[in-house]
């Protein structure tokens, strides 16, 4: 029986240009975490599987960096970033927990570069 | 348990438009995952045609890209199919599935076989 | 797009012989492969999932390994409802593409 829940940032929202740590948490569960997957709906950010450590996709490769922890992070952010983030946490014996932040990636903001009156 | 079944006309005359429905009972296609349709020609294998997500934004294969189209009706809990132009190699059996996370289809249509004649 | 080479295209093997089949992809997907079991007449059937987690209900003779371009679908022993046509799938990115299919037959 899978008892785990996971624990996620939930909605995020970051300025262009800048970096955004992607984090969940299994906790409720004594299940072994084997392997977690970031992922979006259409493409896989980055896998860490215990046994052969992290692969980052080579789409990503420049703005991705591992960690911290099982989390990810997110540089040079762009307005094309927004969107639904997945973490997918294979664990032993209890199966698949799936996880999901949205990030909102906003220009920056108006109190920096807004018209002042 | 979640179930899916396409239906639509098993003839379709060449040039014309292909279009199938698979109604989707035991889950909400708003609620969560990606719903997709992948064919299967007759004795050939598999290809992943596209998907309609929960949200509604749709993914194709770039293959077929210029000719698809997957859309949804919420009320009725159904996603479509409408492929253009259609020629003798779209002659295939047609599944809907559901893509879980990660991208695997645990959940499919039985499949609806469309042959494409004049 | 990634493409999904298996080998062999067709196996002829005993009940309670040990089955292997390959699928080779074009370039590195680290573990996002899954495998499929296809009958006569039915939809394709989901066996294993990211290189090698078994999917619910799946008997424990199908076992997957492998990762960056080279997987492996075994069956320990061989029964024989296991005749079928076997696929493999990359999860990676769109477009999925499937492997071109292994037919499993009982000798």
């Known amino acids: 029986m899978m008892t785990g829940t996971i624990e996620t940032t939930g909605n995020i929202s970051a300025e262009k240009g800048g970096s955004i740590i992607l984090q969940c948490h299994l906790s409720s569960t004594t299940a072994q975490v084997t392997q977690v997957n970031w992922e979006q709906q259409d493409q896989l950010l980055a896998i860490c599987n215990a046994d052969l450590g992290w692969h980052i996709s080579p789409s990503f490769k420049d703005r991705v960096a591992p960690g911290p922890g099982l989390g990810l992070t997110l540089q040079s952010l762009t307005v094309n970033d927004t969107g639904e983030y997945f973490c997918i946490y294979h664990t032993y014996p209890d199966g698949t927990y799936t996880g999901r932040i949205f990030l909102e990636v906003l220009e920056s903001s108006v109190a920096e570069h807004g018209a002042r009156f | 348990d979640v179930q899916l079944q396409e239906s639509g006309p098993g003839l379709v005359k060449p040039s014309q438009t292909l279009s199938l429905t698979c109604t989707v009972t035991?889950?909400?296609?708003?609620?969560?995952?990606?719903w997709n349709w992948i064919r299967q020609p007759p004795g050939k294998g598999l290809e992943w045609m596209g998907y309609?997500?929960?949200?509604?934004?749709?993914r194709y294969n770039p293959s077929l890209k210029s000719r698809i189209t997957i859309s949804r009706d919420t009320s009725m809990n159904q996603f479509s199919l409408k492929l253009n132009s259609v020629t003798a190699e779209d002659t295939a059996t047609y599944y809907c599935?559901?893509?879980?996370?990660?991208?695997?289809?645990?959940?499919w249509g039985q499949g609806t076989l469309v042959t494409v004649s004049s | 797009d990634i493409q999904m080479t298996q080998s062999p295209s067709s196996l002829s093997a005993s009940v309670g012989d040990r089955v292997s089949i390959t699928c080779k992809a074009s370039?590195?997907?680290?573990?996002?492969v899954a495998w499929y079991q296809q009958k006569p007449g039915q939809a394709p059937r989901l066996l294993i999932y990211?290189?090698?987690y078994r999917y619910t209900g799946v008997p424990d003779r199908f076992s997957g390994s492998g990762s960056g371009t080279d997987f492996t679908l075994t069956i320990s022993s061989l029964q024989a409802e296991d005749v079928a046509v076997y696929y493999c799938?990359?999860?990676?990115?769109?477009?999925?593409?499937f492997g071109q299919g292994t037919k499993l037959e009982i000798k």
């Open positions: 990211s290189a090698s």
């Open positions: 309609i997500s929960y949200s509604g934004s749709a």
């Open positions: 799938q990359h999860h990676y990115s769109t477009p999925y593409t």
């Open positions: 035991g889950y909400s296609i708003t609620s969560d995952y990606a």
């Open positions: 599935a559901r893509k879980g996370y990660p991208a695997y289809f645990a959940y």
């Open positions: 370039q590195d997907v680290s573990t996002a």
